[in-house]
């Protein structure tokens, strides 16, 4: 096909001698709502912001990734060609870096349903150069972990020298996914989940008087566990005060969310306060409703065979604690009007 | 608890700091704490965000950045600081704080606090 | 900002009967999604939080749906109580999960 009328688009991968490193190509079509193919999905044209991944169809797997040979040869399919070169869904995968990947790379969809999805095409002119300078000796990993339940932070390894100040706007896409509202070099993520694990790409332009090109660097973002430092938080009951009916049984449950410590000893217990006195009330044994690598939901309900008028004069307390200190939450029962 | 106080009747062109105060809690490190506006008879509609936790990082809705401007000033207080006050700015100003493991609700809220901007 | 676009703006069904108010983001916001329930002079209450898990206290007749870019709130068995404007928010922004952008309401009448 001619692949004249594509849309052109030049990167740059500087990759760094002393580690591994992955690359990759977004099927990037600029302007969808431009090619009656490019935005055959379930958002409309004004929906699609310009610069997104390709998502010209509900099934993302159809697009056919070309290389054009630069001896002039015809267009090579890459999944025949080049076995260090992967597809998934839009995206090209370079799994080991050098310079025999630089080239141009051209994407389109598979099937094309009318005249405008002729020119539906991105070409790619990749440029693939080892990083020469040591000028930045502390430069950004493409491989950074990020601390379960704690602050953490994604550095642009291509930007990492650079304040903040001086760093040129960044785009930054999350597994495939434009992240439209960080800008900055630096991503900051306030709590980390298991969710923020995944492969980012990070984009800048840099221009000389002739053209400009985009720098892209590939960080592979890897969520790891630490003991927490958080006390348990209760998650139910949230509110301070229950409706109930007089002479009915009643089951109050509290559960509780505990972070991940390799010496895990939880405590989860209802005590009851009335005026000056308080006991603790024996109550079927807790249980873990859920369990994460970061951390464990537990639960232990009180039971009362029939709610009494003394109980409306007293306190329900639940306690939790863990190493690092304990949270309660009491609930005042409300006789129910009407 | 949450309750917000600063509203009060200003002219346009005018500079407000609302108060945002906890009781019986504070505004610890796992949670967002966030303020919410609504114009009489109109939706609710998004300001600012605050982490209470070390990051420290902050969120505008596009419309309010530069003109509003979120603050914790201590353990149990988030300010909102608002320039250049118009008509349009006009509404009861509710704050917020996340709940447990799902931060992005908000399931404790202030009664909320009156500015009117009128000349 | 994302776009949070509500319909209906106003729904009005007998009591006993079922309403079904419906979200649409901008963009994928992965369930990252609540919905309030906002009596006049009040503050808002959270009814569902993650889309579709009901927050605590809430009746079962609240069920929220969706996935993406879709969002629906469904109340079945009306209730005079359950009159009210009903609110859908965002909770996604970045890599971070923060509370933001409201829908713009959908008036319920019960009658």
């Known amino acids: 096909f001619n692949i004249s009328g594509c849309s052109t688009k030049k990167l740059l991968w500087t990759y760094s001698t002393r580690s591994e490193e992955e690359f990759v190509l977004f099927c990037d079509l600029p302007e969808p709502q431009k090619s009656h193919f490019c935005h055959r999905n379930r958002l409309s044209p004004k929906q699609v912001p310009e610069h997104l991944p390709f998502m010209g169809s509900n099934d993302l797997s159809d697009v056919q990734w070309y290389q054009q040979p630069s001896n002039g040869d015809p267009l090579e399919d890459i999944r025949k060609s080049y076995p260090h070169i992967i597809q998934d869904k839009c995206t090209l995968h370079f799994l080991t870096p050098g310079v025999n990947n630089s080239g141009s790379y051209i994407c389109r969809p598979k099937m094309i349903k009318s005249p405008y999805d002729v020119a539906c095409c991105v070409k790619m002119i990749l440029e693939v150069k080892p990083q020469t300078n040591a000028s930045c000796e502390y430069s950004a990993s493409h491989k950074q972990d990020l601390l379960l339940g704690s602050t953490g932070s994604i550095s642009c390894p291509s930007l990492s020298c650079q304040s903040d100040a001086q760093s040129p706007a960044v785009t930054w896409y999350k597994n495939g996914k434009l992240l439209s509202v960080e800008r900055s070099n630096r991503i900051v993520v306030d709590e980390v989940y298991d969710y923020h694990q995944g492969t980012y790409v990070c984009d800048y332009t840099q221009s000389d008087t002739v053209s400009s090109w985009t720098v892209r660097a590939v960080v592979q973002v890897r969520t790891i566990v630490g003991d927490t430092k958080l006390k348990p938080d209760i998650l139910d009951p949230v509110e301070d005060t229950l409706e109930v009916e007089l002479g009915k049984p009643l089951t109050i449950s509290c559960k509780a969310r505990f972070g991940f410590e390799r010496v895990f000893n939880p405590v989860i217990k209802w005590y009851i306060k009335d005026s000056d006195l308080e006991w603790e009330v024996s109550v079927p044994e807790a249980k873990s409703i859920k369990s994460t690598l970061k951390d464990e939901i537990i639960e232990r309900n009180i039971i009362l065979e029939k709610v009494t008028q003394r109980d409306l004069r007293r306190k329900f307390v639940c306690f939790v604690q863990n190493s690092i200190g304990n949270t309660t939450q009491s609930v005042q029962l409300k006789e129910k009007r009407g | 608890s949450l309750e917000e106080s600063g509203g009060v009747l200003v002219k346009p062109g005018a500079s407000l700091t609302l108060t945002c105060t906890a009781s019986?809690?504070?505004?610890?490190?796992?949670?967002?704490i966030c303020w919410v506006r609504q114009a009489p008879g109109k939706g609710l509609e998004w300001i600012a965000c605050?982490?209470?936790?070390?990051?420290?990082?902050t969120y505008y809705a596009s419309w309010a950045k530069g003109r509003f401007t979120i603050s914790k000033t201590s353990s149990t207080t988030v300010t909102l600081q608002m320039t250049s006050l118009t008509a349009a700015d006009t509404a009861t100003y509710f704050c917020?704080?996340?709940?447990?493991?799902?931060?992005?609700?908000?399931?404790?809220w202030g009664p909320g606090t009156l500015v009117t901007v009128s000349s | 900002d994302v776009v949070m676009t509500q319909t209906p703006a106003s729904v009005s069904e007998p009591v006993g009967g079922t309403v079904s108010i419906n979200c649409q983001a901008s963009?994928?916001?992965?369930?990252?999604l609540a919905w309030y329930q906002q009596k006049p002079g009040q503050p808002p209450k959270l009814l569902i939080y993650?889309?579709?898990n009901l927050a605590s206290g809430v009746s079962s007749r609240f069920k929220g749906s969706g996935s993406g870019t879709e969002y629906t709130l469904t109340i079945s068995d009306l209730e005079c109580d359950d009159a009210a404007t009903y609110y859908c928010?965002?909770?996604?922004?970045?890599?971070?999960?923060?509370?933001?952008?409201f829908g713009g309401g959908t008036e319920v009448v019960v009658k």
């Open positions: 928010q965002c909770g996604i922004y970045g890599v971070n999960f923060v509370p933001n952008v």
């Open positions: 993650g889309a579709s």
């Open positions: 019986g809690i504070d505004f610890s490190s796992s949670y967002y």
């Open positions: 963009e994928d916001i992965e369930s990252y």
């Open positions: 605050i982490y209470a936790g070390s990051s420290g990082s």
């Open positions: 917020a704080r996340g709940t447990g493991s799902s931060h992005y609700t908000s399931n404790l």
